[in-house]
Amino acid sequence: SITGISPITESLASLSTYNDQSITFALEDESYEIYVEDLKKDKKKDKVLLSYYESQHPSSESGDGVDGKMLMVTLSPTKDFWLQANNKEHSVELHKCEKPLPDQAFFVLHNRSFNCVSFECKTDPGVFIGVKDNHLALIKVDYSENLGSENILFKLSE
């Protein structure tokens, strides 16, 4: 469960891949599309509002009782729209929604090497936001092998 309905902190940051491609958002036919692309040097990077929440592990998972805290994040590139996991389609989509946000909008934040982060679906542990064919997609990760896999690594720059 998420401990408290308010985020502990928020920040505005641009999101890029491990290989320095930018994550951009474009309004097309009244819905937002998400792209992974090389930006021209003079083009301003899109910013995303990251809201950070604390979430308690079930004690059976963490072995810590009430001590097993995770950091979760929601990502909003524009007012009232949030990134959401569509586990059926293995896709990442932007949806307009009101608070309280659905579980599909929450991602467990993982700090990774080289000051990168990964985003794991709250609703589907082991499934991460990743890059596939120049789009964001949900990617199943084998914990024992691929947690450092470059296609699920992202950089945040403020």
């Epitope: 902190t9 072995g63 805290k69 950091l71 700090n111 000051n115």
Partner: antibody, heavy 122, light 107 residues
Framework: EVQLVESGGGLVQPGGSLRLSCAAS????????MSWVRQAPGKGLEWVSA????????YYADSVKGRFTISRDNSKNSLYLQLNSLRAEDTAVYYC???????????????WGQGTLVTVSS | DIQMTQSPSSVSASIGDRVTITCRAS???SSWLAWYQQKPGKVPKL??????SLQSGFPSRFSGSGSGTDFTLTISSLQPEDFATYYC?????????VGQGTKVEIK
């Protein structure tokens, strides 16, 4: 209850080596990034090294890079710091510390051991 | 590397005083700043994390604020048990760095 107990400190000559250990209990060690932090006598805190939960990623302060090696054995619930080419300025109490969050290190160190003293002197 | 600069290095205050300690980062660290309290001969304790979240077990007279490069730790009404050294630490990016500490002493 979370417990971190350091051992392995002592008196060593300049250029010598030591291996510090930290025995962890009361939590699942593999779920957390762990760190070593030191404090020279009468001085402030200095972060030394960190290691990811799996042990796959390690990080060092510039002052110890190439001389110290952090490692962990999650099956033994233990964290280690190998100290080589020791210098007088490495004299300090060495603490092992556990991060607040299971998947993220953004929250800082929630739990600390009592520390073990390393004295480098001839 | 990100340098963390605390000020003042020491402060003399009386019981009931409001005490403010500042911490400045040499580059932006978002809200990823922790404050620790250390009493003489004791282990440091996590006091504030994510710049403003108070760690359980500490009273509400402690508060933290700031983001980016400038951060503040405030003790609204100093109590006898608050006399200690306080450290800020950035947890934004490696290598993690710690401020030099601020000693809060009895006037």
């Amino acid at each position: 209850e979370v417990q971190l107990v350091e051992s392995g400190g002592g008196l060593v000559q300049p250029g010598g080596s030591l291996r510090l250990s930290c025995a962890a209990s009361g939590f699942t060690l593999s779920s957390y990034a762990m760190s070593w932090v030191r404090q020279a006598p009468g001085k402030g805190l200095e972060w030394v090294s960190a290691i990811s939960g799996s042990g796959g990623s390690t990080y060092y302060a510039d002052s110890v890079k190439g001389r110290f090696t952090i490692s962990r054995d999650n099956s033994k619930n233990s964290l280690y710091l190998q100290l080589n080419s020791l210098r007088a300025e490495d004299t300090a109490v060495y603490y092992c510390a556990k991060t607040l969050y299971t998947t993220s290190w953004y929250g800082g160190f929630q739990h600390w051991g009592q520390g073990t003293l390393v004295t480098v002197s001839s | 590397d990100i340098q963390m600069t605390q000020s003042p290095s020491s402060v003399s205050a009386s019981i009931g005083d409001r005490v403010t300690i500042t911490c400045r980062a040499s580059q932006g660290i978002s809200s990823w700043l922790a404050w620790y309290q250390q009493k003489p001969g004791k282990v440091p304790k996590l006091l504030i994390y994510a710049a403003s979240s108070l760690q359980s077990g500490f009273p509400s007279r402690f508060s933290g604020s700031g983001s980016g490069t400038d951060f503040t730790l405030t003790i609204s009404s100093l109590q006898p048990e608050d006399f200690a050294t306080y450290y800020c630490q950035q947890t934004h990016s490696f290598p993690w760095t710690v401020g030099q500490g601020t000693k809060v002493e009895i006037k």
